[in-house]
Amino acid sequence: EQAPGTAPCSRGSSWSADLDKCMDCASCPARPHSDFCLGCAAAPPAPFRLLWP
């Protein structure tokens, strides 16, 4: 949930009300209880190119 008056988080990150800060979604697999991970599930990280056909 985005705090009022803050800029949207960049791609691959999500707002943490708990920390008053955008946080990197990459940490969520290891730390699933972080509040910002809820926003990461709704906004997956940037797509990547497959290295094989």
């Epitope: 009300a17 708990d18 920390l19 940490s27 730390r31 699933p32 209880h33 972080s34 509040d35």
Partner: antibody, heavy 123, light 111 residues
Framework: QVSLKESGPGILQPSQTLSLTCSFS??????????VSWIRQPSGKGLEWLAH???????RYNPSLKSRLTISKDTSRNQVFLKITSVDTADTATYYC???????????????WGQGTSVTVSS | DIVLTQSPASLAVSLGQRATISCRAS??????????MHWYQQKPGQPPKLLIK???NLESGVPARFSGSGSGTDFILNIHPVEEEDAATYYC?????????FGGGTKLEIK
């Protein structure tokens, strides 16, 4: 194991600048998600959060004191600093630093505190 | 600022009985899936010690006689059965938004 220790001047006069140091061990302030807060407690009274600094040098302040506060860090020396300008007798308190970082599950509790340093402002 | 009001300010509980401490927030400190309320114990001359994080999650090493509950604006810390070493002042604290604030404290005396 994690430990934090505050140090300060003990006594200073009104209008002076209070400089506090938090020296810590057992964790790194370069770890993503890690942060350190300063909290104070006048004798016999409650707790007041003052400021917080994150691993990436982002900072947050209590709006009621923001104009007087400056928090900073020296990651390589495992130290966090707080300066309070123009102190008055109302700033007399025990000052604590506390770690706020990710636990195993990804919660961010203020889980380790220093023993505190007593500061008296008196003319 | 979110104001946290604790009640009672002090209470005396007999050994082995239940102590119940309330913390009421001036606005909600919860979302649909998260409650940003924490509880600390402080003994004279010592720093606060984290007991419960995020309403009901016991900190490592804290005895199971401590428990927390609540959501929105109303939160409870229960201690049962109370032991002599539980004599202390207890504080609630939220991290829902800045500034992070603490309740005024509840002093627990063991009879």
């Amino acid at each position: 194991q994690v430990s934090l220790k505050e140090s300060g001047p003990g006594i200073l006069q009104p209008s002076q600048t209070l400089s506090l140091t938090c020296s810590f061990s057992g964790f790194s302030l370069s770890t993503s998600g890690m942060g350190v807060s300063w909290i104070r407690q006048p004798s016999g009274k409650g707790l007041e959060w003052l400021a917080h600094i994150y691993w990436d040098d982002d900072k947050r302040y209590n709006p009621s004191l923001k104009s007087r506060l400056t928090i900073s860090k020296d990651t390589s020396r495992n130290q966090v600093f707080l300066k309070i300008t123009s102190v008055d007798t109302a700033d007399t308190a025990t000052y604590y630093c506390a770690r706020r970082g990710p636990d195993y599950y990804g919660y961010y509790p203020m889980d380790y505190w220093g023993q505190g340093t007593s500061v008296t402002v008196s003319s | 600022d979110i104001v946290l009001t604790q009640s009672p300010a002090s209470l005396a509980v007999s050994l082995g009985q239940r102590a119940t401490i309330s913390c009421r927030a001036s606005k909600s400190v919860s979302t649909s899936s998260y409650s940003y309320m924490h509880w600390y114990q402080q003994k004279p001359g010592q720093p606060p010690k984290l007991l419960i994080k995020y309403t009901s999650n016991l900190e490592s090493g804290v005895p199971a006689r401590f428990s927390g509950s609540g959501s929105g604006t109303d939160f409870i810390l229960n201690i049962h059965p109370v032991e002599e070493e539980d004599a202390a002042t207890y504080y609630c604290q939220h991290s829902r938004e800045l500034p992070w604030t603490f309740g005024g404290g509840t002093k627990l005396e063991i009879k």
